[in-house]
Interface confidence: medium
C-alpha cells in the first residue's frame, strides 16, 4: 500500500526532503516553477501504492509590453515578465499622459496601458441633449476654456447650467430638458 | 505598509466648498494615481474623479464644473476640492490608490460629510 | 455612461451553499471588478478584471464573465462572506460606474 517515486508534473517542484517510500495517506505538496502559478490544488496524496492528484501549473508570465503611441518604455525591458512586474512608459514631448502610468502583468495578462494626448486640451463637439441643441453651429474642435450654450425646444424647460466648457479636453455635464408637468 | 488617510470637515454650509486632504504612506504617489469615490445611500457609489501619477487628472463630466484634484508628491498628499455643496452631496468621501485597470486596490477610511445649514 | 445591474439586490444563502450574484451593463465593457463592503468599512478589493482575486481573497471565490454579463460565485458560503458586493466597470472612453451592490446574508 506504500507508493514509490514521486510523480513529475510539468512545470511543478515538490517541497520538502524526497524520499523513496511514501507511506499510504501521506501528502506531498507541490510548488510551481517561476512564471507559474498553481491552478487548483497542490498535493498529490498516496492512495493504494497510487498518487492521486494533479496539480496544474499554469504560465502566468506576459510578454510584449502594450505599445502606447507617442510613448517610450522607461523601465528594463525583458524577454518575460512575471505576474505582478510592472513596466513605466513615459510621452514624448509634448504629449501629455492620461490614465496609469505603468501597465502590470496580471496572471498572463497586461493592465489597460495610459494614452498620450495632445496637452492643448482640446474638445470634440459637445454632447446632444435630448429636446434640445447649442445656440451656435457646432465645430469638430473647441479650444479648451471655450464655452457653448444649449436651449430647449418649445414646450421644454432647461434644468442644470445652460453654459458648459471644455476643461483638460472634457465638457462639463450638460443641462437638461424637461417637459413641464402637466396639471 | 500601505494607508490612505483622510481628514477633512464632517459638516459643510450649503453652496460653500469641501475641502479634503488624503496623505498617503507606504507607497510614493510618484508611481500611483489616486480616485476619489463618495457613497451615499441615495446614489451609491459614485466615481468622482482621478489624479494619475503623472500630475494629470480625469473627471467625471458630472463634477468636472466644480471639482479640482492636486497633490504634493513631495508630502505625499492629494487634495480634493469641491465647490458649491448641496444637501444631496451629503455622502461618504473616499479616496483610494489605482491598482491598473481602474480598479482601486486600498481605500482611505472615508470622510463622512453633511451639507446643512 | 455604462449602468450596472446587480442582482439580486438581496440575497440570502446557508453556510456551504454556493451561490452566484450577476452584474449586467447596459453596453459592453472593457473590465468589471468587485468590491466588498462591510458595515461601518471601506470597500475592499474582492476580484479585479473579471476573474483575478485579490490578496487575501479565499479561493472559493471566482469570477467570471465577459461583453455585458459578469458574475462572482461563492462556491461553499463562509459566514464572513456576509457582506454587500459591488461591480465596478471600466470602459473604454466612459467614467467609472458602480452597480447599486448585491448584499449577501447568512440564514
Known amino acids: 500500500t506504500d507508493c514509490l517515486s514521486l510523480p513529475s508534473f510539468e512545470n511543478a517542484i515538490p517541497m520538502g526532503e524526497k524520499k523513496d517510500v511514501y507511506k499510504a495517506g501521506e501528502q506531498v505538496t507541490y510548488t510551481c516553477a517561476t512564471y507559474y502559478k498553481m491552478d487548483g490544488a497542490s498535493n498529490v496524496t498516496c492512495i493504494n501504492s497510487r498518487w492521486t492528484g494533479r496539480p496544474t501549473c499554469r504560465d502566468t508570465s506576459c510578454v510584449n509590453p502594450p505599445t502606447v503611441q507617442n510613448a517610450y518604455i522607461v523601465s528594463r525591458q525583458m524577454s518575460k515578465y512575471p505576474s505582478g512586474e510592472r513596466v513605466r512608459y513615459q510621452c514624448r514631448s509634448p504629449y501629455e499622459m492620461f490614465g496609469d502610468e505603468e501597465v502590470m502583468c496580471l496572471n498572463g495578462n497586461w493592465t489597460e496601458p495610459p494614452q498620450c494626448k495632445d496637452s492643448t486640451g482640446k474638445c470634440g463637439p459637445p454632447p446632444p441633449i435630448d429636446n434640445g441643441d447649442i445656440t451656435s453651429f457646432p465645430l469638430s474642435v473647441y479650444a479648451p476654456a471655450s464655452s457653448v450654450e444649449y436651449q430647449c425646444q418649445n414646450l421644454y424647460q432647461l434644468e442644470g447650467n445652460k453654459r458648459i466648457t471644455c476643461r483638460n479636453g472634457q465638457w462639463s455635464e450638460p443641462p437638461k430638458c424637461l417637459h413641464p408637468c402637466v396639471i | 505598509q500601505v494607508q490612505l488617510r483622510q481628514s477633512g470637515p464632517g459638516l459643510v454650509q450649503p453652496s460653500q466648498s469641501l475641502s479634503i486632504t488624503c496623505t498617503v504612506s507606504?507607497?510614493?504617489?510618484?508611481?500611483?494615481?489616486v480616485y476619489w469615490v463618495r457613497q451615499s445611500p441615495g446614489k451609491g457609489l459614485e466615481w468622482l474623479g482621478v489624479?494619475?501619477?503623472?500630475?494629470?487628472?480625469d473627471y467625471s463630466a458630472a463634477f468636472i464644473s466644480r471639482l479640482s484634484i492636486s497633490k504634493d508628491n513631495s508630502k505625499s498628499q492629494v487634495f480634493f476640492k469641491m465647490n458649491s455643496l448641496q444637501a444631496d452631496d451629503t455622502a461618504i468621501y473616499y479616496c483610494?490608490?489605482?491598482?491598473?485597470?481602474?480598479?482601486?486596490?486600498?481605500w482611505g477610511q472615508g470622510t463622512s460629510v453633511t451639507v446643512s445649514s | 455612461q455604462i449602468v450596472l445591474s446587480q442582482s439580486p439586490t438581496i440575497l440570502s444563502a446557508s453556510p456551504g451553499e454556493k451561490v452566484t450574484m450577476t452584474c449586467r451593463a447596459s453596453?459592453?465593457?472593457?473590465?468589471m471588478h468587485w468590491y466588498q463592503q462591510k458595515p461601518g468599512s471601506s470597500p475592499k478589493p474582492w476580484i479585479y478584471a473579471t476573474s483575478n482575486l485579490a490578496s487575501g481573497v479565499p479561493a472559493r471565490f471566482s469570477g467570471s464573465g465577459s461583453g455585458t454579463s459578469y458574475s462572482l460565485t461563492i462556491s461553499r458560503v463562509e459566514a464572513e462572506d456576509a457582506a454587500t458586493y459591488y461591480c465596478q466597470q471600466r470602459s473604454s472612453s466612459n467614467p467609472l460606474t458602480f452597480g447599486a451592490g448585491t448584499k449577501l446574508e447568512l440564514k
Open positions: 489624479i494619475w501619477s503623472g500630475g494629470t487628472t
Open positions: 507606504g507607497f510614493s504617489l510618484t508611481n500611483y494615481g
Open positions: 483610494a490608490r489605482n491598482f491598473g485597470n481602474y480598479a482601486m486596490d486600498y
Open positions: 453596453s459592453s465593457v472593457t473590465y
